[in-house]
């Protein structure tokens, strides 16, 4: 039978009455247009909603926007458009919400043609009040907050100037001209690229990378011949043009650009690209595009310095620069990532890694599913997950895969079961163990969200027709109840719940259409009365993550340690609550070869845990570049995986000697770098 229709599915008692008492409708006094929603702060209940409506006139477009505020998680909204003097807000800049619980909000206004600069509205009290500020420039990008100090803002102007404010946008100073890209680093540092000649586009590959650590008082050039740069974890990456030709290479710094090392990655040509797929303080996943318009490349994983890379996955689907990749970090279980590969026959298949890119495998076929028409063998096939690429192809996939750090082990995604990703209408699948096993959760495409740290999953069917029914599950998607939240169906546009999945409120957004008018409407449902009591100790059970063989002493060991979690029992209907903290008990494992990546010059043959020397490097001295000096590597082929905590057991020898020879690209060597003060 279909999921949720089994006899053993216990019904939540009196849920209709409980939810009816906690369903709040708000009709917005608005023509439809577009709507954007932002949460201000964490656990504050404050939501800002900006509706915009464009009326195309013959000569120009007339725009009108309205701003609404809720302080009870969307149950009630107040029109606060007068606080921003009924000004038309530019939606392309969105609402710039300050980091953490700063309560800061910046809205960028549309200004008339001849004005000297733009206009912003600033709030530092969770949008209770706004201050209008006229800018001495026209902004090109949204205001960017320093992660360390929300009073510090930076923005690029339409004239390519880099502007900084030290008092939350009250006063602005242009600290540099001819800037292409600017980013905040750590400790209020700003990194930016500049052009010398014509423009950012014309100087691509000849840009300079600058750094200021004092908001523009002084500068240091930390790289030249730059194509682009990026920050990931504690790594600063620069893509640098080679001296002789049009190829470029990745250089990496872990000291804010003072010293650089050349990453042991293939160089790329004009039509290729590098992309940082994921990065943390331990390591980075780097995609290197294949030559030609192939639509795929190779994933490499770095060592702890971001310098030595191991090939992780071949034929990784990534369409073009800035294009689509399905690479997804499964945040509900450490070490798990999902992505797609383009197989030799052009079909697309999903792969998963449980050990941070060490090994990739197909997803196990769900127990309750048949292999579809893509499968050659009807008994053997895999689950294939729809993500960004499928969405870009306009397949019937309303949402990307979903996981939340505090909903341990839960992954929800659209998928198909066969030999490859299918264009057939997908179903929704759930894993409760971080991707090891899967179950069909819902028939057909749905929108879905996680509430109360996994205590409730909410779903709405993806339909072109108006809807008035929401589905919810209190047992991680095994059984489903349906609730009719309104008599009058609405054209559904989105589900909204507070980021972090701790809330028990869900907002259903849509619009109603009558003969001549259409209006935005939201229904906010509070599930607090469904989960009547707070969870107690008896409601939780011990779960060993990454467990595949309970008989094995090393069962659950991933990256050198295993973790036991306290997880809510599926049968318990109770509140984890807003203050819920994931309880985990780590224990260190003995080292095995699985805890080591293959070192520079070595690779792992398929289905083998031993690293063997690359044939083309056999008998050669292994030398590589580190901090601008050439290093000689003595190794038996292994290096510890970044973040691996194993102790004892296997301990391969690894020694690095300084050859006292220069080796970085000359344009990144420290002597060439210069400083200047304003």
């Amino acid at each position: 039978s279909a999921p949720g229709e089994d006899e053993e599915c216990g019904r939540v008692r009196d849920f209709v009455a409980k939810l009816a008492n906690n369903t709040h409708q708000h009709v917005f006094d608005d023509l439809r247009g577009s709507v954007s929603l932002s949460w201000v702060g964490d656990s504050t209940g404050v939501i800002l909603v900006l509706t915009t409506f464009h009326v195309p006139l013959v000569i120009m477009t007339f725009g009108q926007s309205k701003l609404y505020r809720s302080e009870d998680y969307g149950k009630n909204f107040k029109d606060i458009t007068d606080l921003i003097n009924n000004t038309f807000i530019r939606t392309e800049f969105g609402m710039a919400i300050g980091p953490e619980n700063s309560g800061k909000v910046v809205l960028t206004a549309e200004v008339s043609g001849g004005s000297r600069g733009g206009r912003i509205f600033r709030s530092s009290d969770f949008a209770k009040n706004f201050v209008q500020t006229d800018l001495p420039f026209h902004p090109l990008t949204q205001m960017m907050y320093s992660p360390q100090n929300s009073d510090y803002l930076l923005a690029l102007s339409t004239e390519n100037g880099l502007w900084v404010s030290k008092n939350f946008g009250g006063k602005w100073e242009e600290i540099h001209k001819a800037v292409c890209l600017a980013k905040w680093g750590s400790d209020n540092t700003i990194f930016f690229t500049t052009y010398a000649n014509g423009s950012c586009k014309a100087d691509l590959g000849a840009l300079e990378l600058w750094r200021t650590s004092d908001l523009g008082k002084s500068f240091k050039t930390i790289g030249v011949k730059i194509y682009s740069f990026g920050l990931g974890g504690r790594f600063l990456f620069a893509s640098v043009m080679a001296d002789k030709d049009t190829t470029r290479r990745i250089h990496v710094s872990t000291d804010q650009g003072d010293t650089w090392s050349m990453a042991q990655l293939p160089s790329v040509g004009q039509e290729q690209f590098y992309s940082i797929l994921a990065a943390n303080d331990d390591m980075v996943f780097m995609h290197v595009d294949e030559p030609g318009d192939t639509g795929f490349g190779t994933i490499f994983t770095s060592d702890d310095r971001g310098i030595v890379y191991s090939k992780s996955l071949d034929r990784h689907l990534y369409t073009t620069t800035g294009g689509e990749t399905d690479f997804t970090n499964v945040t509900s279980l450490r070490g798990v990532y999902i992505t797609s590969v383009l197989s030799e026959d052009n079909s697309i298949q999903t792969m998963i890694t449980f050990d941070q890119g060490g090994r990739w495998t197909h997803l196990r076929k769900p127990e309750n599913s048949e292999c579809d028409a893509t499968a050659k063998n009807k008994n053997e096939c895999s689950l294939h997950i729809h993500a960004s690429y499928s969405i870009s192809q306009k397949l019937n996939v309303p949402m990307a895969p979903l996981s939340e750090p505090n909903a341990v082990g839960i992954v929800i995604a659209h998928g198909s079961v066969g030999d490859a990703i299918s264009v057939m209408v997908p179903d929704v699948y759930i894993s409760d163990d971080g991707g090891y096993s899967w179950t069909k959760m819902l028939e057909g495409p749905h929108y879905y969200t996680i509430l109360d740290s996994g205590g409730i999953i909410v779903a709405i069917e993806h339909s072109s027709r108006p809807i008035n029914v929401i589905k919810f599950s209190t047992d991680e998607g095994q059984c489903w109840q349906t609730y009719t939240f309104t008599r009058d169906p609405i054209y559904f546009t989105g589900l909204a719940s507070e980021p972090g999945a701790r809330s028990m409120n869900i907002s259903i957004w849509g619009f109603t259409e009558s003969f001549l008018t259409s209006q935005w409407v939201s229904y906010t449902i509070d599930f607090k009365d469904i989960l009547e009591r707070n969870c107690e100790e008896k409601d939780y059970t011990i779960w060993l993550a990454h467990s595949t063989d309970p008989e094995d002493y090393e069962d659950g060991c991933i990256l050198g340690y295993k973790e036991q979690f306290l997880r809510l029992r599926k049968s318990s209907v109770c509140q984890n609550g807003r203050d819920y903290v994931v309880t985990k008990q780590p224990s260190i494992c003995l080292c095995s070869l699985e805890d080591f990546l293959c070192d520079f010059g070595y690779y792992r043959p398929e289905n083998d845990s031993k690293c063997v020397e690359q044939p083309e490097l056999k008998g050669h001295d292994l030398e590589f570049c580190l901090y601008g000096r050439e290093e000689h590597l003595t190794t038996n082929g292994y290096r510890k995986i970044p973040g691996d905590k194993c102790q004892g057991g296997v301990n391969p020898v690894r020694e690095v000697k300084d050859l006292k020879k220069k080796c970085t690209s000359n344009f990144l060597s420290p002597e060439k770098q210069n400083s200047k003060s304003n």
Epitope: I348, D372, Q393, L395, A420, V425
Partner: antibody, heavy 121, light 107 residues
């Protein structure tokens, strides 16, 4: 068993627009698959015109792209071809066909019986 | 675009004999090649896809082989109903293209 049936006028005047419909039975278009149009001038080989997903994503032959529109109507379980500014060179048997279920692959498993369209004044 | 060249244009074979049809691609199409059979007044019928996988209901006497640029369709023992025109088609890169066809006729 899926069946496809082309329909539309057998005679179209030069410079006008050729319009054909492919009715699908035995399978719901909205459930998936690629759907395509292929043509064959009398006594000649096959030429792919274009394909569409059930979701509306289209892929056209660049040589015809400026003149072709393929659309899908899931409510009627049919998909259509429009070819504008036709000339005598567009005279052919037009086939509709169903492609494979895999994303990124496009051969044709099921075909309609074809309909001859003659372009003549 | 990828050009598919089929040879021979006409193949004369006696019933019960083996027929070997060739399809050459102007650039690699990996294993993204399909074969169709078309009889006069009928629509094409899919025989092989993925260079070597037989479509549902296709007799075992039809087999496909090859990858990259050289492909072969083999009919191990020709039956009277096999006399027809055979087309190859690639779906490696857009636009999809067909070969010019090989006519298998009774010797």
């Amino acid at each position: 068993q899926v069946q496809l049936q082309e329909s539309g006028p057998g005679l179209v005047k030069p410079s006008e627009t050729l319009s054909l419909t492919c009715a699908v039975s035995g399978y719901s278009i909205s459930s998936g698959y690629y759907w395509g149009w292929i043509r064959q001038p009398p006594g000649k080989g096959l030429e792919w015109i274009g394909s569409i997903y059930h979701s509306g994503n289209t892929y056209y032959n660049p040589s015809l792209k400026s003149r072709v529109t393929i659309s899908v109507d899931t409510s009627k379980n049919q998909f259509s071809l429009k070819l504008s500014s036709v000339t005598a060179a567009d005279t052919a048997v037009y086939y509709c066909a169903r492609g494979p279920p895999e994303l990124g692959k496009m051969y044709f498993q099921h075909w309609g019986q074809g309909t001859l369209v003659t372009v003549s004044s | 675009e990828i050009v598919l060249t089929q040879s021979p244009a006409t193949l004369s074979v006696s019933p019960g004999e083996r027929a070997t049809l060739s399809c050459r691609a102007s650039q690699s199409v990996s294993s993204n090649l399909a074969w169709y059979q078309q009889k006069p007044g009928q629509a094409p019928r899919l025989l092989i896809y993925g260079a070597s996988t037989r479509a549902t209901g296709i007799p075992a006497r039809f087999s496909g082989s090859g990858s990259g640029t050289e492909f072969t369709l083999t009919i191990s023992s020709l039956q009277s109903e096999d006399f027809a025109v055979y087309y190859c088609q690639q779906d490696r890169k857009g636009p999809l293209t067909f070969g010019g066809g090989t006519k298998v006729e009774i010797k």
